[in-house]
C-alpha cells in the first residue's frame, strides 16, 4: 500500500468543521482506517470512494479539541501485509486573544459546568469572536472538563477553578468591557503545587507529539505571561 495524498494539518477555531483527506493505492486496493490520538476515531463521519485502484477517504470532524489524526492504509498480498501511514495535527487557535484585541461583553454566568466554581452572579467576559459566545465557551469548558476526571483529587478542584476562570474570565464593565486575567501566582500554584505530576505528564506527552491535550492548549494559560498580583490590585483576578 502506498499513500498518494496525505492528510494536511490544520489550525482552526474551536467549533469548526474540518475534512481530512487521505488517498492511497495498491494491489489489491487498500483499506483505510483513521486513528485519533492513538485510538480509533470516536466521532466524525467517514466517506470513501474507490476508483482505478485508488481509495479516497474523507474524515469530517467537528473540532472541540486538538488531536493527532493518522491515516493507515493496509492491504494484504498473499500472507504479506503492507501498511502505509500518514498523520496530521489539528490544533485550535487560542480562543483568548490578547486583551487589546478582545471584543466582547460582560454578562452574568448562566452556564452549568462552572456553576460551583464561579461566584454567584459572577460577571464574566463573553468573546464575540464566536457566533454564540455563551454556548461556545461553555462547550470549550465542557470538553476540557471531561479530561479532568482522570486527575488526582488534589489537582482536580484547582484545575477546574483555573479552567473556569480562564475561559470565563472576570469582566470589568465599562465603555470597553475588559476581561481580567487570572493572576500569575494562582496559575503557578496549580501548575507547581496542586497539579505538578499531571502537568509534567501532560507536557511530556505534548513534547513527544503523542497528543495535544485540550487542558494544555485551551484551558491552561501560560503562567509566565499572566499579570502578577504584586503589580496592581486590579491587574488580575486573585482566585
Amino acid at each position: 500500500a502506498r499513500i498518494l495524498r496525505a492528510p494536511e494539518s490544520h489550525n482552526v477555531t474551536f467549533g469548526s468543521f474540518v475534512t481530512l483527506h487521505c488517498t492511497a493505492t495498491g494491489i489489491p486496493v487498500p483499506t483505510i482506517t483513521w486513528i485519533e490520538n492513538g485510538n480509533a476515531v470516536s466521532s466524525g463521519s467517514i466517506q470513501e470512494s474507490v476508483k482505478d485502484r485508488v481509495i479516497d477517504s474523507r474524515l469530517q470532524l467537528f473540532i472541540t479539541k486538538p488531536g493527532l489524526y493518522t491515516c493507515i492504509a493496509t492491504n494484504k498480498h498473499g500472507e504479506k501485509f503492507s501498511t502505509a501511514k500518514a498523520a496530521a495535527t489539528i490544533s485550535i487557535a487560542e480562543w483568548s486573544k490578547p486583551q487589546k484585541d478582545n471584543k466582547g461583553y460582560c454578562a452574568q454566568y448562566r452556564g452549568e459546568v462552572c456553576n460551583a466554581v464561579l461566584a454567584k452572579d459572577a460577571l464574566v467576559f463573553l468573546n464575540t469572536s464566536y457566533a454564540d459566545p455563551e454556548e461556545a465557551q461553555e462547550l470549550l469548558v465542557h470538553t476540557a472538563w471531561n479530561e479532568l476526571k482522570v486527575v488526582s483529587p488534589v489537582c482536580r478542584p484547582a484545575a477546574e477553578a483555573l479552567l473556569c476562570n480562564h475561559i470565563f474570565q472576570e469582566c470589568s464593565p465599562g465603555v470597553v468591557p475588559t476581561p481580567i486575567p487570572i493572576c500569575r501566582e494562582y496559575c503557578l500554584a496549580v501548575k507547581e503545587l496542586f497539579c505538578a505530576k499531571e502537568w509534567l505528564v501532560m507536557e511530556e506527552k505534548t513534547h513527544r507529539g503523542l497528543y495535544r491535550s485540550e487542558m494544555h492548549l485551551l484551558s491552561v494559560p501560560e503562567c509566565s505571561k499572566l499579570p502578577s498580583m504584586h503589580w496592581d490590585p486590579t491587574a488580575c483576578a486573585r482566585l
Partner: antibody
Framework: EVQLVQSGAEVKKPGESLKISCKGS????????IGWVRQMPGKGLEWMGI????????RYSPSFQGQVTISADKSISTAYLQWSSLKASDTAMYYC???????????WGQGTLVTVSS | DIVMTQSPLSLPVIPGEPASISCRSS???????????LDWYLQKPGQSPQLLIY???NRASGVPDRFSGSGSGTDFTLKISRVEAEDVGVYYC?????????FGQGTKLEIK
C-alpha cells in the same frame, strides 16, 4: 526542604558600596517572588521591595526606591540587595523572604546584619 | 500606602490566660474572591519572623491551634487561647493587598 540562606554580617564605612545575597533552594526559584525586609535596631519590620527571579521584574516601596537595588541571578538561585553609597542610617538587619503564591511570606532567611559606622 | 495600626503595643500576659491583638488597616483588605489579604507573623527574640496566620484566618503549617485569626475588611484580631512561655516575642500584622506591602508597628507580648 525550602531554604533561604543569606550572606554573613557586614561592617562598612559610610560612602562604601555593598551587595548582600540570599540563596534559595528546595523549590522552583524562578516561580516565586523574593522580598526584602529591613529591621532597624530595636524597631519594627519594613517591606523594601520584591523581585521575580523568572524575569527580574522588581517592585520597590517608595521609601526605598532609588536608595537600594534589588537584583537576582536565576542561574545560581540567588537574590541580591545592594547599596552604591551606604549611610549610617542603613545600619539594620536585612531579611529576605519568599512570597508564596498567595502573597504571604512563608519562608525567611536568617537575616544579614549590616553595620555602617565611621 | 495602606497604613496598618496595631494595639496594644505591649501586652503582659499570665501563662494560661488568653491574649488578643488588634490590627486595623486604612483600606479594606477584602478581595472579590472573599479572602482578606492580611497575615500575622511572630518574631521571637533573636530569630527571623515566622508566619502564623495567612489570608486573615488560616493557620500556617506547624502553628499550634491555640492561635487563631479573625476579622474582615479593615478590622482584624489575633487571639491566643492560652498563652505559653514560648509565645513571647513581637507580633506583626502585614497587608499584602497592594504594594507597597506594610506591617503594623508590632505588639510585644511578654510573660507577667
Amino acid at each position: 526542604e525550602v531554604q533561604l540562606v543569606q550572606s554573613g554580617a557586614e561592617v562598612k564605612k559610610p560612602g562604601e558600596s555593598l551587595k548582600i545575597s540570599c540563596k534559595g533552594s528546595g523549590y522552583s526559584f524562578t516561580s516565586y517572588w523574593i522580598g526584602w525586609v529591613r529591621q532597624m535596631p530595636g524597631k519594627g519590620l519594613e517591606w523594601m521591595g520584591i523581585i521575580y527571579p523568572g524575569d527580574s521584574d522588581t517592585r520597590y516601596s517608595p521609601s526605598f526606591q532609588g536608595q537600594v537595588t534589588i537584583s537576582a541571578d536565576k542561574s545560581i538561585s540567588t537574590a541580591y540587595l545592594q547599596w552604591s553609597s551606604l549611610k549610617a542610617s542603613d545600619t539594620a538587619m536585612y531579611y529576605c523572604a519568599r512570597h508564596s503564591h498567595w502573597g504571604f511570606l512563608d519562608y525567611w532567611g536568617q537575616g544579614t546584619l549590616v553595620t555602617v559606622s565611621s | 500606602d495602606i497604613v496598618m495600626t496595631q494595639s496594644p503595643l505591649s501586652l503582659p500576659v499570665i501563662p494560661g490566660e488568653p491574649a488578643s491583638i488588634s490590627c486595623r488597616s486604612s483600606q479594606s483588605l477584602l478581595q472579590s474572591n472573599g479572602y482578606n489579604y492580611l497575615d500575622w507573623y511572630l518574631q521571637k527574640p533573636g530569630q527571623s519572623p515566622q508566619l502564623l496566620i495567612y489570608l486573615g484566618s488560616n493557620r500556617a503549617s506547624g502553628v499550634p491551634d491555640r492561635f487563631s485569626g479573625s476579622g474582615s475588611g479593615t478590622d482584624f484580631t489575633l487571639k491566643i487561647s492560652r498563652v505559653e512561655a514560648e509565645d513571647v516575642g513581637v507580633y506583626y500584622c502585614m497587608q499584602v493587598q497592594q504594594t507597597p506591602y506594610t506591617f503594623g508597628q508590632g505588639t510585644k507580648l511578654e510573660i507577667k
